[in-house]
Interface confidence: medium
């Protein structure tokens, strides 16, 4: 669809005569008839297949024709067509004399014709005017013409229809060749698809308008590229929704069980070495001069009873000093001036001569020690009880009184509440600080997995539209991860329009 435009510029009829040679009275009141038709090698009479148009009287004899397009007038003349422009045409322009006001053909005398021109040729669609001039023996006509496409039609033949729009059917303008050019933020064949926020995750995010990024269930963040971990996950992360993968040093279903008490709490004091010995339990190995569960107590150097043979120990700033009893000498009173003849062995100890009687050695009965059997054995001095156990001397032996949660000769064993397999139906047992917890398999619940419940929440395929189903372990419910274009707890809602029509 387009328009053939003809702009009449100047008509010269100096003598004011008709085609017959007869003069007009008082002058030639001139109007034009135009016929546009298909290409003919020889332009001949017949239907004006592309259209006709007539002008009012434009002037007398010789005159210039005013461009009247800006004022809504009839120059240039418009010959619209509703077909593909063929690229060729025939054009007939007749100049007529109007003796009166009635310009209809039947109202004019047959010899009122002033001049007639006929041209034919090729003409491409375009904005440029072609200027032409036709001269006969008595007249001259100067004019120009062109073919342009109607609004919303494009292409070499005005055959491509394209209407710019910005609504639900598309968001685009038209290029000169009629192809669509999407408005910013839109894409697709008809520019109906919004371009989401740059970087918005292809699977986990979607949008209903440009520069938007809406997250599907289980995902979060500006670009929907961060998974949401299991509800209650404390010290863990996820790589897919509802996971809880524990950070180093943490365990349990919710990663809330401390497996690295030493690092997280640094309980050992005074430079002691800390060793993890189970969940929330540890052992401190003290540096010399310190004692206590956390090596928090400073030992006197005399506490280790360094003076032998009944010597008494005195603390000093730079160490200690032994005061030896008669008959002994040395740093620790370890050297004797006595022999077995002096009965040096106490508490029933047996004396044995050494070095030809120059020295002796005492063999002590049970529960006594020291070079003269002068010390009662204290089996707790080596602090043998682990995990804060209390050491008790019991006659010839010792025993450890353990803190709650520990057992064994030296309190070295963590009491496992799981040892008796309390979780029914294949449940997994987790030791907690004060008790235990069962993780039940699908279909069971209760504190000990003793209650048979429904089968796996996803087994009934509750999610619509090919959504992925996840079972939420903490609530025994399902979560649907929707594909592009769907929302809702079961992905049952297409991302469409509300019932009002905002577009």
């Amino acid at each position: 669809s387009g328009v053939f435009q003809l702009q009449l510029q100047e008509f010269i009829n100096e003598r004011g005569v008709l085609a017959s040679g007869r003069p007009c009275e008082p002058g030639c009141r001139t109007f034009f008839r135009v016929c546009l038709k298909h290409f003919q090698a020889v332009v001949s009479p017949g239907p004006c297949t592309f259209g006709t148009v007539s002008t009012p009287v434009l002037g007398t004899n010789s005159f210039a024709v005013r461009d009247d397009s800006s004022g809504g007038g009839r120059n240039p003349l418009q010959l619209p067509f509703n077909f593909t422009w063929p690229g060729t045409f025939s054009l007939i322009i007749e100049a007529w004399h109007a003796p009166g006001d009635d310009l209809r053909p039947e109202a004019l005398p047959p010899d009122a014709l002033i001049s007639k021109i006929a041209i034919q040729g090729s003409l491409a669609v375009g904005q440029n005017w072609l200027l032409d001039e036709q001269t006969s023996t008595l007249t001259r006509l100067r004019y120009s013409y062109r073919v342009i496409c109607s609004d919303n039609y494009y292409g070499d033949n005005c055959s491509r229809l394209c209407k710019k729009r910005n609504d639900h059917f598309g968001h685009y303008v038209c290029q000169p060749d009629g192809n669509l050019s999407c408005l910013p933020g839109w894409t697709g064949e008809y520019c109906q698809q919004p371009i989401c926020l740059s970087g918005c995750h292809e699977q986990n995010g979607y949008c209903s308008k440009p520069a938007e990024c809406l997250c599907r269930p289980g995902w979060q963040g500006r670009l929907c590229n961060e998974c949401i971990p299991h509800n209650g996950c404390r010290h863990g992360t996820c790589s897919t929704p509802w996971q809880c993968t524990c950070d180093e040093g943490w365990g349990g279903l919710f990663c809330d069980q401390d497996l690295n008490y030493c690092t997280h709490h640094s309980p050992c004091k005074n430079g002691a070495t800390c060793s993890n010995s189970g969940q929330r339990s540890y052992t401190c190995t003290c540096r010399p001069g310190y004692t206590g569960v956390d090596c928090e107590l400073e030992l006197s150097e005399c506490d280790s009873n360094p003076c032998r043979n009944g010597g008494s120990c005195k603390d000093q700033e730079d160490g200690y000093h032994c005061l030896c009893p008669p008959g002994y000498y040395g740093l620790h009173c370890e050297h004797s001036t006595l022999s077995c003849a002096d009965s040096p062995c106490f508490n029933g100890g047996s004396c044995r001569e050494r070095n030809q009687g120059a020295n002796y050695a005492c063999e002590c009965p049970p529960n006594f020690t020291g070079s003269n059997c002068e010390k009662k054995v204290d089996r707790c001095t080596s602090n043998p009880c682990a995990n804060g156990g209390q050491c008790l001397n019991r006659g010839p032996s010792r025993m450890c009184r353990c803190r709650p949660g520990f057992t064994g000769t030296y309190c070295e064993l963590h009491v496992s509440d799981c040892a008796r397999n309390p979780c029914a139906h294949g449940g997994t047992c987790h030791d907690l600080e004060n008790g235990l917890m069962c993780t039940c398999p699908a279909g069971f619940s209760g504190r000990r997995c003793e209650v048979r419940t429904s089968i796996d929440a996803c087994a009934s395929s509750p999610c619509f539209n090919r959504a992925t189903c996840y079972t939420d372990l903490s609530t025994d419910t399902f979560v649907c991860n929707c594909p592009y274009g769907f929302v809702g707890s079961r992905c049952e809602f297409p991302v469409g329009l509300p019932p009002s029509f905002p577009w």
Epitope: R165, H168, F169, Y190, W503
Partner: nanobody, 123 residues
Amino acid sequence: EVQLVESGGGLVQAGGSLRLSCAASGSTFTSYAMGWYRQAPGKQRELVAAISSDDSTYYADCVKGRFTISRDYAKNTVYLQMNSLKPEDTAVYYCNAPHSDYDEEAPSDFGSWGQGTQVTVSS
């Protein structure tokens, strides 16, 4: 006032096809966009497909590639060809004239809804 009469619904097995028709009487709607809507029990009415006066089409993502909207200007009728039907397509289907920024706004007498036609897809 324009009367919109929907027909062509019924019971069909999943994977089957139906063709809905919407005939308008009392006015011509050649200048207006026309759309097919559906409403499942307990859900909001949603636009499924639309066709503008220059035959541009719009489809909701959930029906793209399965449903085709068309119109017959001579008969004042809009059609919805539904292929590869799924149980989730079960709903009452209505036709009406949505407003578009490009098409002239539908006259006020398009405001009333027809009775609709029930489409049930069994699995």
